[in-house]
């Protein structure tokens, strides 16, 4: 039975040209994490694998940095970065846990962080 939960940074907003940290945390499970994928809609941004470390997709190499921890930092944000982001935890023996973050990139200087929420 999958007992874990993923806590994410939830709905967040940031300024155009700025940077933002996307974070997910898997808790309430003793399953071993073998890989964490970060995806934007259907595009792979980055992978952190237990044996191979980090891999950043070539098309995002200039604007994506790993960390802190298993999070992901997006830099030089554009309005086109607005959308859904997913963290996908591959675990053994539980299987896959997925967290969702919605990022809105704003033209204005008013960018407030949304509340955190949990995805069972």
């Amino acid at each position: 039975m999958m007992t874990g939960t993923i806590e994410t940074t939830g709905n967040i907003s940031a300024e155009k040209g700025g940077s933002i940290i996307l974070q997910c945390h898997l808790s309430s499970t003793t399953a071993q994490v073998t890989q964490v994928n970060w995806e934007q809609q259907d595009q792979l941004l980055a992978i952190c694998n237990a044996d191979l470390g980090w891999h950043i997709s070539p098309s995002f190499k200039d604007r994506v940095a790993p960390g802190p921890g298993l999070g992901l930092t997006l830099q030089s944000l554009t309005v086109n970065d607005t959308g859904e982001y997913f963290c996908i935890y591959h675990t053994y023996p539980d299987g896959t846990y997925t967290g969702r973050i919605f990022l809105e990139v704003l033209e204005s200087s008013v960018a407030e962080h949304g509340a955190r929420f949990q995805i069972p």
């Epitope: 806590e7 940290i21 974070q23 945390h25 898997l26 808790s27 003793t30 994490v33 073998t34 890989q35 964490v36 952190c48 694998n49 237990a50 191979l52 470390g53 980090w54 891999h55 950043i56 190499k61 940095a65 790993p66 960390g67 802190p68 921890g69 298993l70």
Partner: antibody, heavy 117, light 107 residues
Framework: QVQLQQPGSELVRPGASVKLSCKAS????????IHWVKQRHGQGLEWIGN????????NYDERFKNMGTLTVDTSSNTAYMDLSSLTSEDSAVYYC??????????WGQGTTLTVSS | DIVLTQSPATLSVTPGDSVSLSCRAS??????LHWFQQKSHESPRLLIN???QSISGIPSRFRGGGSGTDFTLSINSLETEDFGMYFC?????????FGGGTKLEIK
């Protein structure tokens, strides 16, 4: 097997500079963070900063920002920490460690830096 | 910066005893807490990853728990090789920070 190799010791004069090295082997150097940690004799561990060899991205603790610079040479799989304007307070063991999915799963043996006239 | 407070500073116990070490964070760090053991004149060794994830090669008597601000490292039936220093580390945000350590000594 994964290894982080550091020189055993360095002796420098007060006010001088030193370049500490950490040579990685047994894994893809550009896929893991390299962290630097300070430990004064018989004391706790202090995080200095980190660098991601794949991009050169780095982060520092504010306390160490003005005294050191982190760099990498991906051709030799070596991370460096430049320390300048050294004082006796900088005498310590300096460790490098890597981070991927696991935090600090491999550590170097540490370099004992002695600042003395 | 996030401050990690470890307690007790020193713990005197007998081999065979079971102990719990505490690490408290100054703010919510979710599960981004890691435990290390360090023996005299040696490099630290990772024991527990992300609060409760076990590490290959580490005896099963070491168990981690907690989330948010309060974390524990439990050691079941201590062996003589377990004595030394224990440190926690947070990786929730930069700068990463270590706790001050707990010294586990033989009574």
């Amino acid at each position: 097997q994964v290894q982080l190799q550091q020189p055993g010791s360095e002796l420098v004069r007060p006010g001088a500079s030193v370049k500490l090295s950490c040579k990685a082997s047994g894994y893809t150097f550009t896929s893991y963070w390299i962290h630097w940690v300070k430990q004064r004799h018989g004391q706790g561990l202090e995080w200095i900063g980190n660098i991601f060899p794949g991009s050169g991205t780095s982060n520092y603790d504010e306390r160490f920002k003005n005294m050191g610079t982190l760099t990498v040479d991906t051709s030799s799989n070596t991370a460096y920490m430049d320390l300048s304007s050294l004082t006796s307070e900088d005498s310590a063991v300096y460790y490098c460690a890597r981070e991927g999915l696991y935090a600090f799963d491999y550590w170097g043996q540490g370099t004992t830096l002695t600042v003395s006239s | 910066d996030i401050v990690l407070t470890q307690s007790p500073a020193t713990l005197s116990v007998t081999p065979g005893d079971s102990v719990s070490l505490s690490c408290r964070a100054s703010q919510n760090i979710r599960n981004s807490l890691h435990w290390f053991q360090q023996k005299s004149h040696e490099s630290p060794r990772l024991l527990i990853n992300y609060a409760s994830q076990s590490i290959s090669g580490i005896p099963s008597r070491f168990r981690g728990g907690g989330s948010g601000t309060d974390f524990t490292l439990s050691i079941n039936s201590l062996e003589t090789e377990d004595f030394g220093m224990y440190f926690c580390l947070q990786s929730n945000s930069w700068p990463y920070t270590f706790g001050g350590g707990t010294k586990l000594e033989i009574k």
